[in-house]
């Protein structure tokens, strides 16, 4: 059951409810070890995770990243502007986990489980976000025509696609986890 | 050695329906995808489609939406098409090839020898 | 849809000598660093052959006189030296993204 369905929360007595930022930590750790189960099945299927085309292959995707100007590492934190970036990286992430949806052969109720648990892990930021005019959300529009794009490639770029998204918001959930456990 | 053994010429009447097979052998046919392409007479060559033969999922031209229809029988490894309220405009070669899956790049490496349909009244 | 443009529509060359066969693309065909061309050669009552792939890659078993070129949007394939047997239907295509299409093809011919 996804953290966020607080089933087990209701079914243990005796344990403190869980605060805010165990929920939000909590909720990462589930999406990533839903993205490990993904990344495995995809790199049993192809040979994508081996490939040297990678670096080159970052210039396709405008996948949401972590920089210095973010605010999110050690150096030059800054909780606010922080805050901000994951929640509006994890906005732009939607579109290719919607993306995810179909890719997957035997972990399908896994991919729908991590776009979904990310929705809640959204909610929750944008509870303890104080700015949230700062948080630009993507255009529909825009998201529809990259979706299309994306799924109009051939079978090798899919799968290159796929290893992609799902290394990228690894690193991201990682980097937030890190950034979130020192606010 | 792989093979793609496609079933015979059809001389089918206007309105009519045809489905035609292409018999996979050589390679696991579960591993790579089935895509077909039309040729009419002396002219150039049209991806009518693709099909996943593992899930049965299947992408389609939009100008052959509702024309062709893709199935596979993964039980004898055969692919077939099938084509409905035919004109004269569908008199062509049909061909089924298979996805070759490169490192570096993705073309249809083994063709089976095509299927003639002819429409006539 | 990519529109693939091939010319020219007939060729005819020497034996022994280049013939150049171009494709353009109307918009790039390249991704991951990769172009998504490739190259096939149809006899009469043939299915086509894959000569090239990804714009440069030899099919094995294809002979050393065949190579591809090009990226981006522009393409094309060499033939050197020109046979007897080269005589046949040459078809670029682009498999980058659905629909997959083909160029109009370059009949080439022993001159």
């Known amino acids: 059951v996804p953290p966020g369905e607080d089933s087990k929360d209701v079914a243990a007595p005796h344990r403190q409810p869980l605060t805010s930022s165990e929920r939000i930590d909590k909720q990462i750790r589930y999406i990533l070890d839903g993205i490990s189960a993904l990344r495995k099945e995809t790199c049993n299927k192809s040979n994508m995770c081996e490939s040297s085309k990678e670096a080159l292959a970052e210039n396709n995707l405008n996948l949401p990243k972590m920089a210095e100007k973010d605010g999110c590492f050690q150096s030059g934190f800054n909780e606010e502007t922080c805050l901000v970036k994951i929640i509006t990286g994890l906005l732009e992430f939607e579109v290719y986990l919607e993306y995810l949806q179909n890719r997957f052969e035997s972990s399908e109720e896994q991919a729908r489980a991590v776009q979904m648990s990310t929705k809640v892990l959204i909610q929750f930021l944008q509870k303890k976000a104080k700015n949230l005019d700062a948080i630009t959300t993507p255009d529909p529009t825009t998201n529809a025509s990259l979706l299309t794009k994306l799924q109009a490639q051939n079978q090798w770029l899919q799968d290159m696609t796929t290893h992609l998204i799902l290394r990228s918001f690894k690193e991201f959930l990682q980097s937030s986890l890190r950034a979130l456990r020192q606010m | 050695e792989v093979q793609l053994q496609q079933s015979g010429p059809e001389l089918v009447k206007p309105g009519a329906s045809v489905k035609m097979s292409c018999k996979a052998s050589?390679?696991?046919?579960?591993?790579?995808?089935m895509k077909w392409v039309k040729q009419s007479h002396g002219k150039s060559l049209e991806w009518i489609g693709e099909?996943?033969?593992?899930?049965?999922?299947?992408r389609y031209n939009q100008k052959f939406k509702g024309k062709a229809t893709m199935t596979v029988d993964k039980s004898s490894s055969t692919a077939y098409m099938q084509l409905n309220s035919l004109t004269s405009e569908d008199s062509a070669v049909y061909y089924c090839?298979?996805?070759?899956?490169?490192?570096?790049?993705?073309?249809?490496?083994?063709w089976g020898q095509g299927t003639s349909v002819t429409v006539s009244s | 849809e990519l529109v693939m443009t091939q010319s020219p529509a007939s060729l005819a060359v020497s034996l022994g000598q280049r013939a150049t066969i171009s494709c353009r693309a109307s918009e790039s065909v390249d991704s991951y660093g990769i172009s998504f061309m490739n190259w096939f050669q149809q006899k009469p009552g043939q299915p086509p052959k894959l000569l090239i792939y990804a714009a440069s890659n030899q099919v094995s078993g294809v002979p050393a006189r065949f190579s591809g070129s090009g990226s981006g949007t522009d393409f094309s394939l060499n033939i050197h030296p020109m046979e007897e047997d080269d005589t046949a239907m040459y078809f670029c295509?682009?498999?980058?993204?659905?629909?997959?299409?083909f160029g109009g093809g370059t009949k080439l011919e022993i001159k």
């Open positions: 295509q682009q498999s980058k993204e659905v629909p997959y299409t």
């Open positions: 099909i996943n033969p593992k899930s049965g999922g299947s």
């Open positions: 090839a298979r996805v070759g899956y490169y490192a570096e790049g993705y073309a249809m490496d083994y």
């Open positions: 050589g390679y696991t046919f579960t591993d790579y995808y």
